[in-house]
């Protein structure tokens, strides 16, 4: 049904290969990304309430299907938050400013504190966003693709469930 | 083409710890979901650990049976992962499997064995 | 977590033979969101490392013989090995990466009758 208005391959908003999207607005993609169609010639991504295509050989194209795949796109961002208000009722926001800053080895707060029992409540620094939700943004300066977690795709349980049963109490402290 | 190569296995006592690492090439690292599966000696597979990507910043998961003992972690600088495994059990014994989760498949490695013995 | 339930637990066979291998999963392994099956078939022979025969439920990793097909949607799931050889000897599993913790099937172990 490529062309059809109310139809899978409908475009709101088609971007052309010979101009992909900006670095802020494929991270608007990322966040916002529900599901995709492939099409005979293109791919359409749909959004929370507006969709886009691109031509299916464009590499943001294949990031994006790439970053749903595997479950690190849509709400996997606000998934990994979204128990931090009963993880560590006490703690402050935890700010995302000094990721990846000075060192090449990533060891996040929920290993560092992964020996800690699950009745232990961490105290983080306090960080630079005001609120959870602005947690929910990726690194707007980085761009990578792999996958989604969305509250009712695969690994709904992962946002839902495991940060009391999976990883303790450190699963969704998710940044230094 | 896609190698995953663990090392580090051995052999230790209860209550004693190991890190194994792997060393990952083929593919682009830090786009991918990393994961350490195990197997013990004529059992079926245990997934382990799950180590996310840096946009959701390297959240880590881990099985039951090691939380609080084990912590995963990643340098995607270096296209590597480790596990550094605390207070180990005798049920700790397996092949430890690196893995690689990307949109073209899981990728495994050899693996590494550890032995947890008195 | 989701329960991963192979059948059968050993299959004898001669030489030529089709196989079919089922797995069951205890809810749905297709997301929407792509349509896709988060379901994985793997080989392992003893001593050697688990192999990748099939991803997303259907699709071949490269390099595996066409005689392997993964087939099956939502919850039961199957792999069918058209004219056995030898060389597939070996015990198949299958594998669910829809959900954290991944979960395997219990396997099915391939013999020569």
């Known amino acids: 049904n490529e062309g059809s208005v109310t139809g899978s391959c409908y475009c709101g908003k088609r971007i052309s290969s010979d101009s992909p999207p900006s670095v802020q607005f494929m991270n608007r993609l990322r966040k916002h990304l529900r599901a995709y169609h492939r099409c005979l010639y293109y791919t359409r991504f749909q959004l929370l309430s507006w969709s886009v295509c691109g031509g299916n050989k464009d590499p943001w194209v294949q990031e994006l299907m790439s970053c749903l795949d595997l479950k690190e796109c849509g709400h996997a961002y606000s998934g990994i938050v979204a128990h931090q208000k009963h993880l560590l009722p006490t703690s402050p926001p935890i700010s995302q400013a000094s990721e990846g800053a000075s060192s090449d080895i990533h060891t996040p707060a929920q290993m560092l504190l992964s020996t800690l029992q699950s009745t232990q409540r961490p105290t983080l620094p306090v960080g630079s966003l005001s609120s959870d939700k602005e947690l929910t943004r990726p690194n707007e300066t980085t761009i990578h693709t792999a996958g989604h977690s969305l509250a009712a795709g695969p690994e709904a349980g992962e946002n839902q469930k495991q940060p009391e049963k999976n990883a303790g109490p450190t699963a969704r402290t998710s940044a230094t | 083409a896609v190698q995953l190569v663990e090392s580090g296995g051995g052999l230790v006592q209860p209550k004693e710890s190991l890190k194994i690492s792997c060393a990952a090439s083929?593919?682009?690292?830090?786009?991918?979901?990393m994961n350490w599966v195990r197997q013990a000696p004529g059992k079926g597979l245990e997934w382990v650990a799950r180590i996310r990507t840096k946009p959701n910043n390297y959240a880590t998961f881990y099985a039951d049976s090691v939380k609080g003992r084990f912590t995963f972690s990643r340098d995607d600088s270096k296209s590597m992962v480790y596990l550094q495994m605390d207070n180990l059990k005798t049920e700790d014994t397996a092949m430890y499997y690196c893995?690689?989760?990307?949109?073209?498949?899981?990728?495994w490695g050899q693996g590494t064995l550890v032995t947890v013995s008195a | 977590d989701i329960v991963m339930t192979q059948s059968p637990s050993s299959l004898a066979v001669s030489a030529g033979e089709t196989v079919t291998i089922n797995c069951k999963s205890s809810?749905?392994?297709?997301?929407?969101?792509?349509?896709?099956?988060?379901l994985a078939w793997y080989q392992q022979k003893p001593g050697q490392s688990p192999k990748l025969l099939i991803y997303?439920?259907?699709t071949r990793q490269s390099g595996v013989p066409d005689r392997f097909i993964g087939s099956g949607s939502g919850t039961d799931f199957t792999l069918t090995i058209s004219s056995v050889q030898a060389e597939d000897l070996a015990i198949y599993y299958c594998q669910q990466y829809y959900d954290t913790p991944w979960t395997f099937g219990g396997g099915t172990k391939l013999e020569l009758k």
């Open positions: 809810q749905s392994l297709l997301y929407s969101g792509n349509q896709k099956n988060y």
């Open positions: 893995t690689a989760w990307t949109t073209e498949g899981i990728y």
């Open positions: 083929g593919f682009t690292f830090s786009n991918a979901v």
């Open positions: 997303w439920a259907s």
